[in-house]
């Protein structure tokens, strides 16, 4: 039975050219996290494996940095980065938990962070 929940940074706005940290946190479960995948739409951005550490997809290595923690830092943002991001927690014995973040990259200098929220 999957009892955990993923808390994410929620809905985020950021400035073009800036950077943003995407973070998820798995709670309410004692399951062991074996790997966390970060995806943008259907593209794999990065993997953090409990044994092997981080792997950044080659096409994103210039703009994606691992961390902090299991999070991911996106740099040199463009308006094309607007969209959904997913943190996919592979755990044992629970299985897979998925969190969702929606990022809007703004042309203006006004960018505010959305509220935190939970995904069951």
């Amino acid at each position: 039975m999957m009892t955990g929940t993923i808390e994410t940074t929620g809905n985020i706005s950021a400035e073009k050219g800036g950077s943003i940290i995407l973070q998820c946190h798995l709670s309410s479960t004692t399951a062991q996290v074996t790997q966390v995948n970060w995806e943008q739409q259907d593209q794999l951005l990065a993997i953090c494996n409990a044994d092997l550490g981080w792997h950044i997809s080659p096409s994103f290595k210039d703009r994606v940095a691992p961390g902090p923690g299991l999070g991911l830092t996106l740099q040199s943002l463009t308006v094309n980065d607007t969209g959904e991001y997913f943190c996919i927690y592979h755990t044992y014995p629970d299985g897979t938990y998925t969190g969702r973040i929606f990022l809007e990259v703004l042309e203006s200098s006004v960018a505010e962070h959305g509220a935190r929220f939970q995904i069951p």
């Epitope: 809905n11 959904e84 969702r100 929606f102 809007e104």
Partner: nanobody, 125 residues
């Protein structure tokens, strides 16, 4: 409770166009992110397009980019999918889906709560 009813499906020749509609009943349509999905015979359901509650943000699967357009008319509680340059591989049952609220679009089926019964689109010469 949101109820979704798709229409507009049918048989069409390759290269032609078709417009699907999804009529929604329920008070929360104007705040509902929505999406179109499809399932071809013997294949898994796949995402086609998605749209935010206000239409500001849209998503398209790579296979339909440049050919399909998702839109909505909140005053009519209706979601649309304009399909141009249809191909044989677009043949499938098309479903619309909705959720009660949320920011941006939702491209993955797991986030949707409400589903229509589907409308069949057959692209054949």
């Amino acid at each position: 409770q949101v109820q979704l009813v798709e229409s507009g499906g049918g048989v069409v020749q390759p290269g032609r166009s078709l417009r699907l509609s999804c009529a929604a009943s329920g008070p929360s349509f104007s705040s509902s992110p929505m999406g179109w999905f499809r399932q071809a015979p013997g294949k898994e359901r796949e995402s086609v397009a998605a749209i935010s509650w206000d239409g500001r943000f849209t998503y398209y699967a790579d296979s339909v980019k440049g050919r399909f357009t998702i839109s909505r008319d909140n005053s009519k509680n209706t979601l649309y999918l304009q399909m141009n340059s249809l191909r044989a591989e677009d043949t499938a049952v098309y479903y619309c889906a909705a959720r009660d609220s949320g920011s941006g679009y939702y491209s993955r089926a797991q986030w949707y709560v409400y589903w229509g019964q589907g409308t069949l689109v057959t692209v054949s010469s």
